[in-house]
């Protein structure tokens, strides 16, 4: 499984420190955890927290690790062969074919739909027409009403066709 | 009888709001929800979201999340939907619509004369 | 999200022609579908919901049918005055949905 990779996600260059572990590649590629020296001869850690490589590659750096966002919260940090996992707060969810940034979740549903599904971190809530025949909020008015000017007032009806 | 009485023409320049108003009579406002639905010239129909002017709850198509803010005015029975950071793509027709949800399926059976608001710099 | 697909996109008929006007939905919307006529320049019109219910004041010569997923609109004799284009819109779940519109004109 290859990832797509672009120049951005490329962790700047380091000379190998001390700290940063060496080893040969095999067969031209480094394992996770690890990007390829220049030379092709080496195989140099990925620091923990700043960089990662998920598979075996020939990658000359490790990608940079992803950083969440406000609005996101931290499920796991980034170690040298896994990238941050970031999820929605509560109450928000990322779309599909949005998901640079987590939306808000519905708090409700249109009378005459009911609600079907919770808020989650990857989903909003969906609203569902009622099936025929139940009571909308035991107001079905058998003619049309008048506009009052408070809710509170009885509205007094008056025989309209739409 | 039912009517939706919009406000009038509005010009924006990119990045601004507008606020359309709809004004209800003939009918208990708080019964019915109110739903904007736009139309850009030679366009089909995009519903926006709507609000239950009794709870003043609301729902909004993704499409405009964060960019519009449905509420309302009980007392003088009208509803207002503001959309900001407009940009050219807004230019449309805005239509208010009252969701009638008795009976055996929901429908907007009164839509509003409609609001043009022009995006332009 | 629930796509309406109108067919077709635009039609000609004559005076006193039997026109159909066909609406698919992406998934099952059971009856929850409703037809508008918009003329130009002007605010939607309901014609039918619940996709068969003929909306009071509506004429006669419009009716729908269908369920789930397929839905028709049909004008038993077309009149000058119905020069107009028709919407879909499923009203099962939300976002509400319409579909593209269908232009009728007379021939």
């Known amino acids: 499984e290859s990832a797509l990779i672009t120049q951005q996600d490329l962790a700047p260059q380091q000379r190998a420190a001390p700290q940063q572990k060496r080893s040969s590649p095999s067969e031209g590629l480094c394992p996770p955890g690890h990007h390829i020296s220049e030379d092709g001869r080496d195989c140099i850690s990925c620091k923990y927290g700043q960089d990662y490589s998920t598979h075996w590659n020939d990658l000359l750096f490790c990608l940079r690790c992803t950083r969440c966002d406000s609005g996101e919260v931290e499920l796991s940090p980034c170690t040298t062969t896994r990238n941050t996992v970031c999820q929605c707060e509560e109450g928000t969810f990322r779309e599909e074919d949005s998901p640079e940034m987590c939306r808000k979740c519905r708090t409700g549903c249109p009378r005459g739909m009911v609600k079907v599904g919770d808020c989650t971190p990857w989903s909003d809530i969906e609203c569902v027409h009622k099936e025929s025949g139940t009571k909308h909020s035991g107001e079905v008015p058998a003619v049309e009403e008048t506009v009052t000017s408070s809710p509170g007032t009885p509205a007094s009806p008056c025989s309209l066709s739409g | 009888q039912v009517q939706l009485v919009q406000s009038g023409a509005e010009v924006k320049k990119p990045g601004a709001s507008v606020k359309v108003s709809c004004k209800a009579s003939g009918y208990t406002f708080t019964s019915y929800d109110i739903n904007w639905v736009r139309q850009a010239t030679g366009q089909g129909l995009e519903w926006m979201g709507w609000m239950n002017p009794n709870s003043d709850n609301t729902g909004y198509a993704q499409k405009f999340q964060g960019r519009v803010t449905m509420t309302r005015n009980t007392s003088i029975s009208t509803a207002y939907m503001e959309l900001s950071s407009l940009r050219s793509e807004d230019t449309a027709v805005y239509y208010c619509?009252?969701?009638?949800?008795?009976?055996?399926?929901?429908?907007?059976?009164?839509w509003g004369q409609g609001t043009l608001v022009t995006v332009s710099s | 999200d629930i796509q309406m697909t109108q067919s077709p996109s635009s039609l000609s008929a004559s005076v006193g022609d039997r026109v159909t006007i066909t609406c698919r939905a992406s998934q099952s919307i059971s009856i929850y579908l409703n037809w508008y006529q918009q003329k130009p320049g002007k605010a939607p019109k309901l014609l039918i919901y619940?996709?068969?219910s003929l909306q009071s004041g509506v004429p006669l010569r419009f009716s729908g049918s269908g369920s789930g997923t397929d839905f028709t609109l049909t004008i038993s004799s077309l009149q000058p005055e119905d020069i107009a284009t028709y919407y879909c819109?499923?009203?099962?779940?939300?976002?509400?949905?319409f579909g593209g519109g269908t232009k009728v004109e007379i021939k």
């Open positions: 619509a009252r969701w009638n949800h008795y009976g055996s399926g929901s429908h907007f059976d009164y």
């Open positions: 619940a996709a068969s």
């Open positions: 819109q499923q009203s099962y779940k939300t976002p509400l949905t």
